[in-house]
């Protein structure tokens, strides 16, 4: 199975230049339990939440978000209303974090390219936001070790380069698509693919499954998601998530187990993966 990846695409609507839409998707075999969309940076690292979408519980959204909705079982869209004349969205980074089971939590960011002429589709401009907390965990020696191994892995992969995927297009004739498409896949080499970002944030899957505010549950009903195209393009990887950061809070609260134990709601750290209780609210 391939490593999961998250793509992010930002569009400016042709009809209303003050309207933006963020599209995000998860390519992987897992079951999505929660999606968090933030702007100004990753969720929990300086970013501000715009929306939280749960596959069954529903959606919560906050201004300037206008409408958050599931587009498919593995992709969402968030429409934004830009009230300011200066269009602050144009220079803003939007991040999408997908919590899935059993992969964990994966996040990617994208922004509207600064020079996007109307009618032209800007080249994908990923925003890698690999956080530094992993370095503190592994130590310099671990990073160096991994770097050597990773380079070897890239050299080996170069001989067996898979067919590049087409970027998912959510455009239509009415949208000026200034797209920022930031696929996040740990095994995808940025050296070979200039538009790929290394997975920006990864929370390893655990037995407990999480609610968005740190409340977790064990899955009671398995809701299988269809495999995305990336899932079948398996490429060898060293270790899933080994070059990505583990979110803050993973070690601080991991022992807590609140309300109901069993398949109910139990506390989980701020690293809100892998599977937030399987359902509640739709589009808000």
């Amino acid at each position: 199975a391939g490593t999961p990846e998250v793509w992010v695409q930002v569009q400016m609507e042709a009809t209303e230049l003050s309207s933006f839409t963020v599209h995000c998707g998860f390519l992987g075999p897992g079951s999505i339990s929660l999606v968090t969309v933030s702007w100004g940076g990753p969720d929990g690292a300086g970013g501000t939440k715009l929306a939280v979408l749960h596959p069954e519980l529903g959606t919560r959204q906050w201004a300037p978000a206008r409408q958050a909705r599931w587009e498919t079982q593995s992709s969402i869209s968030l429409a934004l209303e830009d009230s300011g004349a200066s269009s602050p969205f144009a220079n803003t980074t939007f991040c999408c974090k997908f919590a899935s089971f059993p992969e964990g939590s994966w996040e990617s960011c994208g922004s509207l390219p600064p020079s996007s002429d109307p009618g032209l589709s800007a080249p994908p401009t990923p925003v890698p936001i690999l956080r530094a907390d992993l370095a503190g965990i592994l130590g310099l020696s671990g990073v160096l070790l991994f770097g050597c191994g990773y380079l070897l892995h890239l050299l080996r992969r170069q001989k067996h380069r898979p067919t590049p995927r087409l970027q998912p297009s959510h455009t239509n004739s009415q949208a000026l698509t200034a797209q920022a498409w930031a696929p996040s896949q740990a095994s995808q080499a940025a050296l070979h693919d200039p538009y790929a970002t290394i997975n920006t944030s990864f929370c390893p899957a655990t037995l407990d499954t999480a609610h968005p505010n740190g409340w977790a549950s064990l899955p009671t009903h398995a809701a299988h998601q269809p495999q995305g195209p990336a899932a079948s393009a398996s490429t060898p990887i060293l270790a899933r998530g080994s070059f990505v950061s583990v979110e803050n809070g993973l070690y601080t609260q991991a022992g807590e187990r609140p309300p109901h134990t069993g398949p109910g709601l139990t506390l989980f750290p701020d690293c809100r993966g892998p599977r937030a209780l399987e359902g509640r609210f739709g589009v808000r």
């Epitope: 069954e56 529903g58 919560r60 498919t72 609210f281």
Partner: antibody, heavy 114, light 113 residues
Framework: EVQLVQSGAEVKKPGSSVKVSCKAS????????IEWVRQAPGQGLEWMGE????????NYNEKFKGRVTITADESTSTAYMELSSLRSEDTAVYYC???????WGQGTLVTVSS | DIVMTQSPDSLAVSLGERATINCKSS????????????LAWYQQKPGQPPKLLIY???TRESGVPDRFSGSGSGTDFTLTISSLQAEDVAVYYC?????????FGQGTKLEIK
């Protein structure tokens, strides 16, 4: 264990304001919204609004806009709901809730009477 | 706003018998993108806050006995208690979990016959 503990019952005069508190424990307070729902005696449930403590972003039910203010204090993990210009029909039990109504406070009875 | 209408307003059922409560929404609660219905059911006993029973129209909350089940799609939903127990006496509410603002049905009072 995740708990939402609300302030005690209040008796208020018409035209005054009431501020109900909801202290959260056992979870990451800033990660998800706190909702406020009220229930008049013998009546159904009515959503008033919500706040996302981390950013203090709010959503309100149009019915209460202008009269209700929801705030949060991250340092004490406490959310507040203030309702102004009280009238007798605001007599109700006010609940705070979180995570899509999976967790609830015990309720606060607010009685508006002259 | 989406209006939620429950029927009946009250219901008396013998212990061990089946109880059925219906809920109708003024707009579809089905999200076409992921084919999920955004409806929840709550149980409220006197002097207590509501308790979540069912979400996503049919997914039982953890710890809820399997005699409780939810079904339906679009605008018509049903909560079924397959074998009524004494502790099930309560008021039951359905809720629109699809769009702002969250709206609740008027409630169905379930009693023992």
């Amino acid at each position: 264990e995740v708990q939402l503990v609300q302030s005690g019952a209040e008796v208020k005069k018409p035209g005054s304001s009431v501020k109900v508190s909801c202290k959260a424990s056992g979870g990451t307070f800033s990660s998800f919204s706190i909702e406020w729902v009220r229930q008049a005696p013998g009546q159904g449930l009515e959503w008033m609004g919500e706040i996302l403590p981390g950013s203090n972003s709010t959503n309100y039910n149009e019915k209460f806009k202008g009269r209700v203010t929801i705030t949060a204090d991250e340092s004490t993990s406490t959310a507040y709901m203030e309702l102004s210009s009280l009238r007798s029909e605001d007599t109700a039990v006010y609940y705070c809730s979180s995570y899509w109504f999976a967790y609830w406070g015990q309720g606060t009875l607010v009685t508006v009477s002259s | 706003d989406i209006v939620m209408t429950q029927s009946p307003d009250s219901l008396a059922v013998s212990l061990g018998e089946r109880a059925t409560i219906n809920c109708k929404s003024s707009q579809s609660l089905l999200n076409s993108g992921n084919q999920k219905n955004y409806l929840a059911w709550y149980q409220q006993k006197p002097g207590q806050p509501p308790k979540l029973l069912i979400y996503g129209a049919s997914t039982r909350e953890s710890g809820v006995p399997d005699r409780f089940s939810g079904s339906g799609s679009g605008t018509d939903f049903t909560l079924t208690i397959s074998s009524l127990q004494a502790e099930d006496v309560a008021v039951y509410y359905c809720q629109n979990a699809h769009s702002y603002p969250p709206t609740f049905g008027q409630g169905t009072k379930l009693e023992i016959k």
